[in-house]
Amino acid sequence: IAPSRPWALMEQYEVVLPWRLPGPRVRRALPSHLGLHPERVSYVLGATGHNFTLHLRKNRDLLGSGYTETYTAANGSEVTEQPRGQDHCFYQGHVEGYPDSAASLSTCAGLRGFFQVGSDLHLIEPLDEGGEGGRHAVYQAEHLLQTAGTCGVSDDSLGSLLGPRTAAVFRPRPGDSLPSRETRYVELYVVVDNAEFQMLGSEAAVRHRVLEVVNHVDKLYQKLNFRVVLVGLEIWNSQDRFHVSPDPSVTLENLLTWQARQRTRRHLHDNVQLITGVDFTGTTVGFARVSAMCSHSSGAVNQDHSKNPVGVACTMAHEMGHNLGMDHDENVQGCRCQERFEAGRCIMAGSIGSSFPRMFSDCSQAYLESFLERPQSVCLANAPDLSHLVGGPVCGNLFVERGEQCDCGPPEDCRNRCCNSTTCQLAEGAQCAHGTCCQECKVKPAGELCRPKKDMCDLEEFCDGRHPECPEDAFQENGTPCSGGYCYNGACPTLAQQCQAFWGPGGQAAEESCFSYDILPGCKASRYRADMCGVLQCKGGQQPLGRAICIVDVCHALTTEDGTAYEPVPEGTRCGPEKVCWKGRCQDLHVYRSSNCSAQCHNHGVCNHKQECHCHAGWAPPHCAKLLTEVHAASGSLP
């Protein structure tokens, strides 16, 4: 993996002497062996007839807040520790003047990693011990002497997991771009087996390689609005904890069984990836459970098959792609990989060939978006707590973080006289700096409207005279009639609306007869059902990408990949006059409310969706019996 003469494994390479651009302050120019790796750094590399300027920034989100390392101590006991002082030397960035460029490098001992310009992926690594200014090899991945690797996830297994092959015809999105959505986070736990440890020789070398790999994987996923955060590393420096077989399917099974046993005492993570030094049978370098992300089977096994860590990073990105519901590109009709060269493949190609892929295809992106629509994917939505991100809070970034009272942006841009922009504390005499109920640094009087009613299932909110923020959004009491249904937690759910959400504008509720039976695994109709609160049955529209369906006559139901579960009619959907679906049955509206809720509000408020009094302007919760001004006067306190 890391032989003493690295260039012996390259066909063609160019020798370059990187030049570090001087930073604005002396501290940035300190040598990296002092342990002060700067926040940002830039290098000029003369390669392939160009001068490339790489602008790099430390990957502050590489390690999760509670990052741990587990290994075996000299006395044979297992040790888990949280390393202190998480300064590191792993960077990401771009190449100046190239809009779609990317770079992911470590600067720990010279420069090692990749930078991408257009469709060209350049790999860089040191040729000697000369550090960042010493001789480096820059080469293209296809000039790395290695055998092609394939993914062990077979088309047969994908077929049963992703539904019938016809369901995988790819329809490009209008505008050909990813839908806008929040960033998703994979909290990753990496296990390194004993064969890999022996190959690399020390815990420090393993740690360095794993951080390099995860840094690269994170960079590849950033284009999909994903971040990959390492929350734990386990190094089997003494012996393997389960049998690592040359058969990748056996190894994956063993990994998942072992993980299930360990979950209670190890990190809560979204995904586990094994990196092994064992040579898998044939050309297989990776194997994964499809669409298993966020479940107990969320994991994959990866052979460290290439001298350059970008190799196993591409494998891990590919196997994680399977965990996220992606199929192999070649299995999908009309799938587009926007690589320039015919040989260029995208990350979800079944075989990596001789060059490392650097992007996801259009169909991989579509599979991913489809996976994210499932409730199962909820584990990816939790961003690591801002206050725990390595690097901590930043005063001047418009976000009020730990220890701050306000944040109005950088000092030269701040126009908020209520906030001291250099300290992010309230200005002298200010009660507040942000919020709808904050005006000229003072909290607005009670009873001022701060959030108007937006539809028939909403309620308006008023300032309470004490807080600068508008009170939490509240909705009409569940069961209040709305267009075609009954309000439920601020929505007005109907069968038609649900079918449109899944099947697009042409989707509509199927005939009533479709709801009259339940479906068993394997698409079999079963016992008679007396209501419309079982499986969601639709007709028309376009089948959602990446979802298997069960068709009986004109009734279309969506299933999970393995066909064992079906999309249910959601809670709160109208199933008849004065009736709603509740706990899987069509029940009377009374299930929503206690009959005397609004009576508790003393005629100065109404009951909301939480069965609490929502008071009219100027009246005080919890029962709207007193005016807010009376309550404040009695407590004698203002904000």
Epitope: Y185, R227, C395, D413
Partner: nanobody, 120 residues
């Protein structure tokens, strides 16, 4: 120097939608936060929405539930989807990128602005 270019502004009727885009010359992943601000004639510039590097978002109360800020790291672009537009949303909308610098205060980079006019 970082360049930010806004687009997508225009004239729209009340209740309509617009989507503003802000393309950056560098990688948006290198900014700690990206934001949209607006300035109506005779008024101070105000923050509309911001998105942190972690994906967390921040909205002015007046636009909550109507506007959505998002970003596409692959395209180095930040978006502001504006639905249910009201005449009071009429303003010049500015894109803002916040760069964090070790040992110094953060620095804001600004675009030239794009005009949004909502007619009643």
């Amino acid at each position: 120097e970082v360049q930010l270019v806004e687009s997508g502004g225009g004239l729209v009727q009340a209740g309509g939608s617009l989507r503003l885009s802000c393309a950056t010359s560098g990688s948006i992943a290198s900014f700690n936060a990206m934001a949209w601000h607006r300035q109506a004639p005779g008024n101070q510039r105000e923050l509309v929405a911001a998105i942190h590097i972690s994906g967390n978002t921040n909205y002015a109360d007046s636009v909550k539930g109507r506007f959505t800020i998002s970003r596409d790291n692959g395209k180095n672009t930040v978006y502001l989807q504006m639905n249910s537009l009201r005449p009071e949303d009429t303003a010049v909308y500015y894109c803002n990128a916040i760069e964090v610098r070790t040992g110094l205060s953060p620095r804001g980079h600004w675009g030239q602005g794009t005009q949004v006019t909502v007619s009643s």
